[in-house]
Interface confidence: medium
Amino acid sequence: PQIFNKSNDGFTTTRSYGTVCPKDWEFYQARCFFLSTSESSWNESRDFCKGKGSTLAIVNTPEKLKFLQDITDAEKYFIGLIYHREEKRWRWINNSVFNGNVTNQNQNFNCATIGLTKTFDAASCDISYRRICEKNAK
């Protein structure tokens, strides 16, 4: 299945001299990503990232998804994608619409994870998963 709608985004990985991420954060395309080793519900994951001055990751390009999947270590991670039941659509936490494919959809699965599979997977918001946080590189 096609995960993303077709896009002309031809991003490549660049690392500018002097651009840094905090210890244990991963750098990609001027952003820093933190893959937690602990787990919690989606709401607590959102707060966890907020406490680190970041947000749950917005994985809105195929390149970003591939980068993160390459480092997710055979685990599932919450990302900043939630299902708005009243609109019947998935939105990123910055409110942009996600028109791609989410597998494992279920009326009780209103949050999403990546890792383990090559797709975005719907998941219960109340079950504990690891989480990916994202913020600007300095």
């Epitope: 244990d24 937690s36 602990s38 787990e39 519900s41 607590e44 966890f48």
Partner: antibody, heavy 122, light 112 residues
Framework: QSLEESGGDLVKPGASLTLTCTAS?????????MCWVRQAPGKGLEWIGC???????TYYASWAKGRFTISKTSSTSVTLQMTRLTAADTATYFC????????????????WGPGTLVTVSS | AIVMTQTPSSKSVPVGDTVTINCQAS????????LAWFQQKPGQPPKLLIY???TLASGVPSRFKGSGSGTHFTLTISDVVPDDAATYYC????????????FGGGTEVVVK
């Protein structure tokens, strides 16, 4: 590979105490949890809380929140700080490692220390 | 918080027989059936027997078998030997946002 707890003592009600768990033959892995479990004399096991080594996140049993604090002090030691101790806290305190099994994160405590006895009495 | 209820609290079993210990969770354990079983002998720390419901820990004999899902779990010990005399505990993991782990009350197995 082994774990050893230290710091157990006889203390008075209301006192504070810090227990240390030291690993020998290995360093804590980023993906593992270090946890504390206690056992009152002649009673069952009671889970206290865990620390995720990789990101420092801690979580606790509801009765332990605010009074017990788990911290990582080095790549081979964690502590359990206990405050406002009462006679009900008298127990053997165990530290245990919970590896994050790939793909499921299952909490099987695969390595335990022998325990250290804490007695709270006036 | 999740509550784990073990039955029976004590069981006497002849050498060579099979013993079954039940563990019921007050709510479904977290994903992938995160239920573990431990064996504890007097004066010793617990020893991991089984994790994620049915996976045998390293070095544990295949006489020990874990099964179940959701809220009902079972530990079965077949061909019981004297060395199996111990207290057995189940432990369930519900997730960090719901007070984490909880142990059952224990089942003492006496081998006749």
């Amino acid at each position: 590979q082994s774990l050893e707890e230290s710091g157990g003592d006889l203390v008075k009600p209301g006192a504070s105490l810090t227990l240390t768990c030291t690993a020998s033959g290995f360093s804590f892995s980023r993906s593992s949890y270090m946890c504390w479990v206690r056992q009152a004399p002649g009673k069952g096991l009671e889970w206290i809380g865990c620390l995720s080594v990789g990101d420092g996140h801690t979580y606790y049993a509801s009765w332990a929140k605010g009074r017990f604090t788990i911290s990582k002090t080095s790549s081979t030691s964690v502590t359990l700080q206990m405050t406002r101790l009462t006679a009900a806290d008298t127990a053997t305190y165990f530290c245990a490692r919970a590896p994050s099994y790939s793909g499921d994160g299952g909490h099987g405590y695969d390595l335990w220390g022998p325990g250290t006895l804490v007695t709270v009495s006036s | 918080a999740i509550v784990m209820t073990q039955t029976p609290s004590s069981k006497s079993v002849p050498v060579g027989d099979t013993v079954t210990i039940n563990c019921q969770a007050s709510e479904s354990v977290d994903r992938n059936n995160r239920l573990a079983w431990f064996q504890q002998k007097p004066g010793q720390p617990p020893k991991l027997l089984i994790y994620t419901t049915s996976t045998l820990a390293s070095g544990v004999p295949s006489r020990f078998k874990g099964s179940g899902s959701g809220t009902h779990f079972t530990l079965t010990i077949s061909d019981v030997v004297p060395d199996d005399a111990a207290t057995y505990y189940c432990a369930g993991y519900r997730g960090a946002h719901t007070d984490g782990d909880a142990f059952g009350g224990g089942t003492e197995v006496v081998v006749k």
